[in-house]
Amino acid sequence: EVEKTACPSGKKAREIDESLIFYKKWELEACVDAALLATQMDRVNAIPFTYEQLDVLKHKLDELYPQGYPESVIQHLGYLFLKMSPEDIRKWNVTSLETLKALLEVNKGHEMSPQVATLIDRFVKGRGQLDKDTLDTLTAFYPGYLCSLSPEELSSVPPSSIWAVRPQDLDTCDPRQLDVLYPKARLAFQNMNGSEYFVKIQSFLGGAPTEDLKALSQQNVSMDLATFMKLRTDAVLPLTVAEVQKLLGPHVEGLKAEERHRPVRDWILRQRQDDLDTLGLGLQGGIPNGYLVLDLSMQEALS
């Protein structure tokens, strides 16, 4: 808090310009009019104010707009945005994508701060859903943004927005998130032909059910091992050896290197050793010949 002192003679600011960087904090407080600052906010970012000086300017805006800044001011905050607290940001009503972009630009290349998280939350809630343009913008600045949302929040993503998602945007998503995103992706890409469809859906397959994997196995997709290893274990277990062979195509040889890891390990335990031997990969751990496999889960479902 800067104490109130009279502005020294000849120092009253007529405009926001670079001469102000040489003002002491108390001089800024005394000599810069808050209304002038608000109308010339677009100049602030071009001037190398120290963060201490920006604190003074923020204080002046807070006094002028105790209920929250108007969007005309917010759009031009620039580095002053870094001095805002989440509490400040919760008072704002940000509706323009241009405003959002301008503020995200300030923090570009750095991890998402609490300020940015609050800003995005306010913006998305104001829009009612995560539309394609917003998602495009957010994932451009924060590739991991989508995976930071809860499954409940992801449910508000319309299928049309899925077109904006790049494979790297899903790198940190867990199975619960992919469970929500996969059906949306399936809907979004439903009109594409086989090979194009697979290219688009591949990143989302960690949420795919068994029946969809079986269908894919009939389409010569040649799924790579990295994608296979991210599939849901419960979706992989019911697949036959023949289906996995068709699904992976030439990549089936990679199963040997992954035989101790999930879901491959658990899948091997469910297959007949005879069937596994047909792959010629030396996979071990299948059900020995002559053993009867009882599917107890099926028994329970029938009773």
């Epitope: 001037i47 190398p48 963060y51 001095k83 750095h110 991890e111």
Partner: nanobody, 116 residues
Framework: QVQLVESGGGVVQPGGSLRLSCAAS????????MRWYRQAPGKERELVAV??????YYADAVKGRFTISRDNSKNTLYLQMNSLRAEDTAVYYC???????????WGQGTLVTVSS
Amino acid sequence: QVQLVESGGGVVQPGGSLRLSCAASGSTFSIRAMRWYRQAPGKERELVAVIYGSSTYYADAVKGRFTISRDNSKNTLYLQMNSLRAEDTAVYYCNADTIGTARDYWGQGTLVTVSS
């Protein structure tokens, strides 16, 4: 974190020249602006010069005599001081602030004495 280390201070006669250097290390990619401040004995610390992008700014007392520059390839800030006067005697501090953390970093200072 950004670390700043100044060098180049010393004793010089009035009218002489000195070049101060400030070597930056650490998260230098996030530096937003760099500045030289000075503090004369018994006085407040004052801003001398700023470099911000490709723009430079100078306090009236040093305009035309001092030049601030930055070599990004060496992560070094410079202050070329010409036509030095007795009133330029002070400890000169290098300062940088960063994007993201919105923090200020300071060097330990280097003493410049202008005396005949």
